[in-house]
């Protein structure tokens, strides 16, 4: 891949906007410069570059100065002011507000439920494979393998608590040491951040919204990746997490506590258990090398069972096979021992859709994966629409000021830490960092929360999920208490260490700059978002996993040159932007590299070729399909969701209607109206006050 996505004309000036330059707050690119230059030569050309057909909005008639895309949009009020309304209007508006609130809560409920079902779907599709990752004996000696297993398993089961509980049970039964478990926990931390990144993809319809949402989601990814990048080598060298947590566990005489309160699950479980119920013990059993578990289905069939424990006499080849020396004897013919046998009697079947279908796990998982993604997407779109209509004018101003404004001087620095506490508290309430960060993503997208504010909230969410784990550990049975508590504390201190690395000093807040860079790239080339997801959460971990299986020599042989190249590119990039004079003329920009190595344009052409077939057949019957269509073919009018096929053909023939860029509109709703996406609403019926 390119050392930097668009480095055709790298300038020493750090203020110049480069696509993907994570470190900058970009200004608008100079279009004349861009269009009067080909990618492979530096000679100016008079030919005007045609706008690509895959661009979402035709950027003709664009003003020379465009606002910073990271500035929050002004959500202007198109409705009548409250004071200007008559009594009937006020009552109507009040009930409209109540209706919207109910709808918002309803969609929010199904959004959270769909996240739960999505997790179940992933477990059905990849749970057994995830369990088998754990049964790899090399985890003990190879922390890098442990890390990628943590990532892959959590991505496959869409739940860090599931992968963490497998690790806990393996440590409890001495199949894994705490030392070997720490990299897996770090990996689980990374894996859990995929959920909100998937949620961000659902906001692909609007470029500016997608830019913010995707950056807001990936700030979590970058924080986790960067923390691991620094803290894994530190842990391998010093074992500081293991030592600190061991001291804590040993210094306290913990008594078994109560289970962490399931606040959100209480509300969502009644619905989700009607869809599907899983026997999550199966994944753990596979991880523990239980051969019988490999043939078991994850779909729970029997919910009410009676377990009868009895002792039976069984023959053993020799006394060495006895359950205990005192429970061994002979009848003169064979050696006997007593074995505890648990007879499971099925009493009542579970009450969920798939209970009587007897479909394979993969089939159930695939069905649920598609349905949950559709519901997730639908709910997200509706949440964004409702929030878009509610958060206007005064309401928006108040909310945005409350959330994004810092404390007065000299306490401004405290605001972020309060946000961390809020994030931790909210996550503790909802019992899931995925739910919290996924709920945050659309708010970032529509511009209610800035990325700068979302960052500490996300960090707090990381802390919140570990406090839940600590509480759960304290409720563990005696034999598992020690190991589960130590692992939960490792998770906690890892996140605390990460925050200390990437938050207190504004200069070190690299995840924000990197996320913004990725947001810029993904807004321009939307396929890159999917590409990023596949690369970082699947390909890199799978490659490392494969190389680790081949042996540490192969891993080092491939890994060292790759790491060296990355470091070299980063150093060069740093020198180019900070002090290019120290570099030879040739190295002052990236033009010495072939175009495909320094720009995403050639890759974009390839992707466009592949998705070209979709462009003509991109008929969207609903908004949900429309979002998927936008992501696939990047077609200009697909988000109008009307007679898509004909529209596209017309669009290809000639685009002579000047349309403003959506970024230049003050109101998201207005910008979509101008593009013909939503009908302009009658201002008389528009209501903003709740």
């Amino acid at each position: 891949m390119a050392p930097w996505p668009e480095l055709g004309d790298a300038q020493p000036n750090p203020d110049k906007y480069l696509e993907g330059a994570a470190g900058q707050q970009p200004t608008a690119p100079d279009k004349s410069k861009e269009t009067n230059k080909t990618d492979n030569t530096e000679a100016p050309v008079t030919k005007i570059e045609l706008l690509p057909s895959y661009s979402t909005a035709t950027l003709i008639d664009e003003p020379t100065e465009v606002d910073d895309p990271w500035n929050l949009p002004t959500l202007q009020d198109s409705g009548i002011k409250w004071s200007e309304r008559d009594t009937k209007g006020k009552i109507l508006c009040f009930f409209q507000g109540i209706g919207r609130l109910i709808l918002l809560l309803g969609f929010l409920y199904f959004f959270v439920c769909s996240l739960d079902i999505l997790s179940s779907a992933f477990q059905l599709v990849g749970g057994k494979m995830a369990g088998q990752f754990f049964s790899n004996s090399s985890i003990m000696s190879n922390p890098l393998l442990g890390l990628v297993i943590g990532v892959l398993v959590t991505v496959l089961v869409q739940s860090s608590s599931t992968s963490t509980s497998i690790v806990v049970s393996m440590v409890s039964s001495s199949l894994l040491t705490v030392r070997a478990a720490i990299p897996i926990i770090m990996g689980a931390n990374i894996g859990t951040s995929i959920t909100n990144t998937i949620v961000a993809l659902m906001q692909v319809g609007d470029r500016s919204e997608f830019r913010r949402a995707f950056a807001g989601a990936t700030v979590h990814d970058f924080f986790n990746w960067l923390s691991v990048l620094v803290l894994l080598p530190v842990e391998v060298a010093t074992h500081y997490l293991e030592i600190i947590t061991q001291l804590i566990v040993e210094s306290f005489h913990f008594k078994n506590g109560e289970d962490a309160p399931d606040l959100l699950k209480v509300i969502t479980k009644p619905f989700t258990k009607l869809i599907v119920q899983l026997d999550k013990k199966v994944i753990s059993q596979i991880a523990m090398n239980d051969e019988k578990a490999k043939n078991k289905s994850l779909v729970k069939i029997w919910c009410k069972t009676f377990t009868n424990k009895t002792q039976i006499n069984v023959t053993v080849p020799s006394t060495a096979n006895c359950t205990s020396p005192s429970l061994c004897w002979t009848d003169g013919i064979q050696n006997w021992t007593m074995k505890n046998v648990t007879y499971k009697e099925n009493i009542a079947k579970c009450q969920h859709i798939f209970v009587n279908f007897h479909l394979p796990d993969l089939a159930v998982g695939t069905i649920l994966l598609i349905l949950s993604l559709l519901v997730l997407c639908g709910c997200l779109i509706m949440i964004v629409k409702i929030l878009g209509s509610v958060l206007k004018g005064q309401v928006a101003t108040v909310i945005k000021k409350t959330i994004n404004t810092d404390f007065p001087f000299p306490f401004a620095w405290l605001t972020g830490y309060l946000a961390i506490l809020v994030g931790a508290g909210m996550t503790f309430i909802v019992q899931s960092s995925s739910v919290f960060t996924s709920a945050l993503t659309p708010l970032i997208g529509i511009g209610v929360i800035t990325i700068e504010r979302a960052y500490p909230l996300t960090l707090g969410s990381n802390i919140g999920t570990t406090t839940t784990a600590i509480l759960a550990a304290l409720a563990s049975p005696g034999n598992a208490l020690r190991s589960s508590l130590q692992i939960a504390l490792c998770h906690f201190f890892f996140n605390i260490s990460g925050i200390l690395l990437w938050y207190p000093i504004p200069f070190t807040r690299l995840p924000i700059r990197m996320a913004k860079g990725l947001g810029n790239i993904s807004a321009k080339y939307r396929w890159f978002a999917v590409f990023y997801l596949i690369i970082f959460f699947f390909l890199i971990p799978l490659t490392v996993f494969g190389l680790s299986l081949a042996g540490w020599r192969v891993l080092v042989g491939v890994g060292v040159p790759v790491v060296f190249i990355i470091i070299l590119v980063l150093c060069l990039r740093l020198l180019q932007s900070r002090c290019p004079r120290v570099l030879p003329k040739k190295l002052q920009n990236w033009n010495f590299l072939p175009l495909w190595m320094r720009s995403l344009k050639p890759w974009d052409a390839v992707v466009s070729k592949f998705t070209g077939c979709f462009q003509m057949r991109c008929c969207c019957c609903c908004r949900v399909c429309c979002r998927a269509c936008c992501l696939l073919c990047d077609c200009p009018k697909c988000c109008r969701c009307s007679k898509c096929c004909e529209d596209l053909e017309e669009a290809q023939e000639g685009q002579d209607v000047p349309v403003k860029a959506p970024e230049t509109f003050d109101n998201i709703t207005i910008s979509r109206e101008a593009q013909g996406e939503v009908p302009a609403s009658d201002s008389k019926t528009e209501c903003t006050a709740l």
Epitope: N313, S318, T319, C328, W329, T330, D331, G332, I333, Q334
Partner: antibody, heavy 121, light 107 residues
Amino acid sequence: EVQLVESGGGWVQPGGSLRLSCAASGFTFSSHIMYWVRQAPGKGLEYVSGISSNGLSSYYVDSVKGRFTISRDNSKNLLYVHMGSLKPEDMAMYYCARGGRDRVPAVFDYWGQGTLVTVSS
Amino acid sequence: DIQMTQSPSSLSASIGDRVTITCRASQSIGTFLNWYQQKPGKAPKVLIYVASSLQSGVPSRFIGSGSGTDFTLTISSLQPEDFATYYCQQSYSVPITFGQGTRLEIK
């Protein structure tokens, strides 16, 4: 009253064979494991063989394995041991003993009066 | 195979005496040890099973104890009919093995 009566003992040349029988009465024969225990003159007790209540599984001490065969006829309440390739060291008093029921520790709660087997040339 | 070692090999005692016979196993056998009494020209008779349980019809002066590898048979007050040879037997694993016996004689 539980009674076990052994028969079939006598003099035999080395390499010869002999079949001992044990007639049981006074208890449900088919419910008990049965054993053969021997005692060489002036020596201690030595376990020889055992057979399960249904006759399907049996055990032989290493020194007699492949030469002795234990069997039972639950319909006639009889226990047998067929001794082949007899050696001088097989010369002993052979006792038939009753064990507990299946799967309980081997306790020889009732013994026969014994039958003497003499192996000499 | 589990070796059973009895001590002493023989002992002399008077009527009314308290007599203790010990039996040691080459490995732990839990409590799966039985004691037998054999009088000259007669078949053995079970006295104690699973280390300490008294067989029905056996006088209560016979007391069995021990677990693991060390076991004892105690005759609290020796009676004339108690002069015989005593054997210990393990029923922990096949093959079943007996001790070499302890001959109890009148002093």
